[in-house]
């Protein structure tokens, strides 16, 4: 039994970082595998985390690390029963994937306007909770160009936008993803997506 | 410095209740690991009592023999872990410890305490008419 | 629950010796495994977890082997301060129990 792909993790930076790797060949991971972390740090403990499957080959790791800082750095050891297959580190804060946003939602009755908003997927105290920057990507069920996204590099989780810039009459869909430029990150998940008719007056055209 | 200290021990009557207070200082006991009680009736050997999960899920696990009896709280502003013990009898008579655990887990809502790497030096409860 | 068995409940041994202890579960527990050595008055202090691995700060006199059911613990050179209890501490998360051996007291020949 050998690793094919190494682990790489990347961290939420909040409680969870999720590690993912390869085999070489089909691997019962919950059974076989078991993926040891333990923050460098004089009494820290070294956890057990039982890997799922990802694929045939693919092994997939939630590691539970709440009160992540900037200085944290982990060891880990993949073990196949006694055997260490793999040894490596894992330093959270430079490999940040944000929570997805929650929350999306489409507010049409503000004169013309739309109005989303969605939650900042992370609690005041946490670093990130005010170096968020979002896109927001909004198609057409109907017509597949109709695709558009919007950057939102504020720090309020909201996006104005004319409902004339949409075409009326039809269903339009919206979600929402965010990063840190701080952490350098990657993006975000995409949040679920919402759904509303969009419609709006034609303004009165005058010869 | 990282310890725990226990306090709330003493002499209670068969029948009896007594809350147990664990105090942790040196780290933050909102953090991923496990709170665990452990006694150790005189001259006898160590008997492990429940855990719960420091983090945000707060999940608890208790020895057969302690459920119903015995019930592990914390307050996480307070970083102190308590355990609440009920209908005492003469043979709950121990020094009783806090203890910070590892953990296994799989996924992020299934979370067992494993091994026991920082002790606190023990709290005696008697229990005597 | 699980059984752990540990056995000798007692020994005798000179500074020096080599000391095994083993403990027996009743159950396949994988290597989720510790051993702890406590001396009177004190609170028990962590040597070995996931049956082999050394604590921060402790000896390498001592070391750990097994897996599934059958644990031993070794002491290479006994030394005047390990004489001592040890237990050793077996975690079944499929019958969700953590259970301690009954001991093995180690007193100066």
């Known amino acids: 039994m050998k690793v094919l792909q190494e682990p790489t993790c990347v961290s939420d930076y909040m409680s969870i970082s999720t590690c993912e790797w390869k085999m070489n060949g089909p691997t019962n991971c919950s059974t076989e595998l078991r993926l040891l972390y333990q923050l460098v740090f004089l009494l820290s403990e070294a956890h057990t985390c039982i890997p799922e499957n990802n694929g045939g080959a693919g092994c997939v790791c939630h590691l539970l690390m709440d009160d992540v800082v900037s200085a944290d750095n982990y060891t880990l050891d993949l073990w196949a029963g006694q055997q260490l297959l793999w040894k490596g580190s894992f330093k959270p804060s430079e490999h940040v994937k944000p929570r997805a946003p929650g929350n999306l939602t489409v507010h049409t009755n503000v004169s013309d306007t739309l109005l989303l908003t969605w939650s900042n997927p992370y609690p005041p105290d946490n670093y990130l909770y005010n170096h968020l920057t979002y896109a927001v990507n909004i198609w057409s069920e109907n017509d597949p160009a109709d695709f558009r996204i919007y950057n939102v590099t504020y720090l309020e989780p909201s996006l104005r936008i004319a409902a004339s810039t949409l075409k009326s009459g039809i269903s339009y869909r919206a979600r929402v993803r965010a990063w840190a430029q701080c952490y350098n990150t990657t993006w975000s998940e995409w949040s679920p997506s919402t759904k509303w008719h969009n419609s709006y007056r034609e303004p009165f055209e005058q010869h | 410095e990282v310890q725990l200290v226990e306090s709330g021990g003493g002499l209670v009557q068969p029948g009896g209740s007594l809350r147990l207070s664990c105090a942790a200082s040196?780290?933050?006991?909102?953090?991923?690991?496990?709170m665990c009680w452990v006694r150790q009736a005189p001259g006898k050997g160590l008997e492990w009592i429940g855990c719960?999960?420091?983090?945000?899920?707060?999940?608890?696990y208790y020895a057969s023999w302690a459920k119903g009896r015995f019930t592990i709280s914390r307050d996480n502003s307070k970083n102190t872990v308590y355990l609440q013990m009920n209908s005492l009898r003469a043979e709950d008579t121990a020094v009783y410890y806090c203890?910070?655990?590892?953990?296994?887990?799989?996924?992020?809502?299934?979370?067992?305490?494993?091994?026991?790497?920082?002790w606190g030096q023990g709290t005696l409860v008697t229990v005597s008419s | 629950d699980i059984q752990m068995t540990q056995s000798p409940s007692s020994l005798s041994a000179s500074v020096g010796d080599r000391v095994t202890i083993t403990c027996q579960a009743s159950?396949?527990?994988?290597?989720?495994l510790a051993w702890y050595q406590q001396k009177p008055g004190k609170a028990p202090k962590l040597l070995i977890y996931?049956?082999?691995t050394l604590a921060y700060g402790v000896p390498s006199r001592f070391s750990g082997s097994g897996s599934g059911t059958d644990f031993t613990l070794t002491i290479s050179s006994l030394q005047p301060e390990d004489f001592a209890t040890y237990y050793c501490?077996?975690?079944?998360?499929?019958?969700?129990?953590?259970?301690f051996g009954q001991g093995t007291k180690v007193e100066i020949k």
């Open positions: 203890a910070r655990a590892a953990f296994v887990n799989r996924g992020v809502s299934w979370i067992w305490p494993y091994y026991f790497s920082l």
């Open positions: 040196g780290f933050s006991s909102s953090s991923a690991h496990y």
């Open positions: 719960i999960y420091a983090g945000s899920r707060g999940s608890t």
């Open positions: 159950e396949d527990i994988e290597s989720y």
């Open positions: 996931r049956a082999s």
């Open positions: 501490l077996g975690s079944s998360y499929s019958t969700g129990s953590n259970i």
